[in-house]
């Protein structure tokens, strides 16, 4: 039995340089782990593709807020 379990760390090394239309986005994950070189957002598209984006960009923050509101409205 190993002393600790190694959990793989997901990092973004490159970020998309164009805006993804909000209709194509399904969810997002924040990447804040300090072992990653950048704080980033991974958007999951409705086709299942994962895309790294820069949360310092306005469209990224707006998309995160929009997705938050969608999920909030889905709650019973």
């Amino acid at each position: 039995q190993p002393d600790s379990v190694s959990i793989p760390i997901t990092c973004c090394f490159n970020v998309i340089n164009r805006k993804i239309p909000i209709q194509r986005l399904e969810s997002y994950t924040r990447i804040t782990n300090i072992q990653c070189p950048k704080e980033a957002v991974i958007f999951k598209t409705k086709r299942g593709k994962e895309v790294c984006a820069d949360p310092k960009e306005r469209w990224v923050r707006d998309s995160m807020k929009h997705l938050d509101q969608i999920f909030q409205n889905l709650k019973p």
Epitope: R30, T32, I34, P37, E39, K56, K65, D68
Partner: antibody, heavy 117, light 107 residues
């Protein structure tokens, strides 16, 4: 390991200005926002504002507009907070912290600013 | 600005107790809530972000819950090292604002 290294204490006369520094190691400040938070003695936390060191863009709580200036030097990987026209109300601990998302996962140990009359 | 209210500024607890600290926003903050622990003479430490997401290295006895305007930090079995002041903070919109803090004191 990330470290935000702040100087321990500053004693400044009322009416003067002070510039507090926050040199970062273990991260590139261009990849995040750098924030400043104020804590007066025995009181809670107040967000002053933040800077995007990649382009110098700043955002402040309106109540600190005109009082605080936030700058960053990417060559030395350091964020700065300048406070002007100091009064006893500015006596506090000032923390720098990092975070793109509006919450703060790494903090400096704080600089205690005492304004004397 | 969004105001954050923590119902108690302090309360007395016993070691081993289950502790619940509440935080209320003046408007919906869509789970954009963080909890911090601060001990005297130290900087705050991030415990939870996104209302429920525990930071790496934070003991599992801490948990966060809530939605809309109302959020809760729970500690299942209070340990000596948990005696501190706890702050909530909204990061839905700037200016980012903190609750007034809840100080835990041993009975």
């Amino acid at each position: 390991e990330v470290q935000l290294q702040q100087s321990g204490a500053e004693l400044v006369k009322a009416g003067a200005s002070v510039k507090l520094s926050c040199p970062a190691s273990g991260l590139n400040i261009k990849d995040t926002y750098m924030h400043w938070v104020k804590q007066r003695p025995e009181q809670g936390l107040e967000w002053i504002g933040r800077i995007d060191p990649a382009n110098g863009n700043t955002k402040f709580d309106p109540k600190f507009q005109g009082k605080a200036t936030i700058t960053a030097d990417t060559s030395s990987n350091t964020a700065y907070l300048q406070l002007s026209s100091l009064t006893s109300e500015d006596t506090a601990v000032y923390y720098c912290a990092r975070g793109v998302f509006g919450f703060f996962d790494y903090w400096g140990q704080g600089t205690t600013l005492t304004v004397s009359s | 600005d969004i105001q954050m209210t923590q119902s108690s500024s302090s309360f007395s607890v016993s070691l081993g107790d289950r502790v619940t600290i509440t935080c209320k926003a003046t408007e919906d903050i869509y789970n954009r809530l963080a909890w911090y622990q601060q001990k005297p003479g130290s900087a705050p430490r991030l415990l939870i972000s996104g209302a429920t997401s525990l930071e790496t290295g934070v003991p599992s006895r801490f948990s966060g819950s809530g939605s809309g305007k109302d959020y809760t930090l729970s500690i299942t079995s209070l340990q000596t090292e948990d005696v501190a002041t706890y702050y909530c903070q909204q990061f839905w919109s700037a200016p980012y604002t903190f609750g007034g803090g809840t100080k835990l004191e041993i009975k």
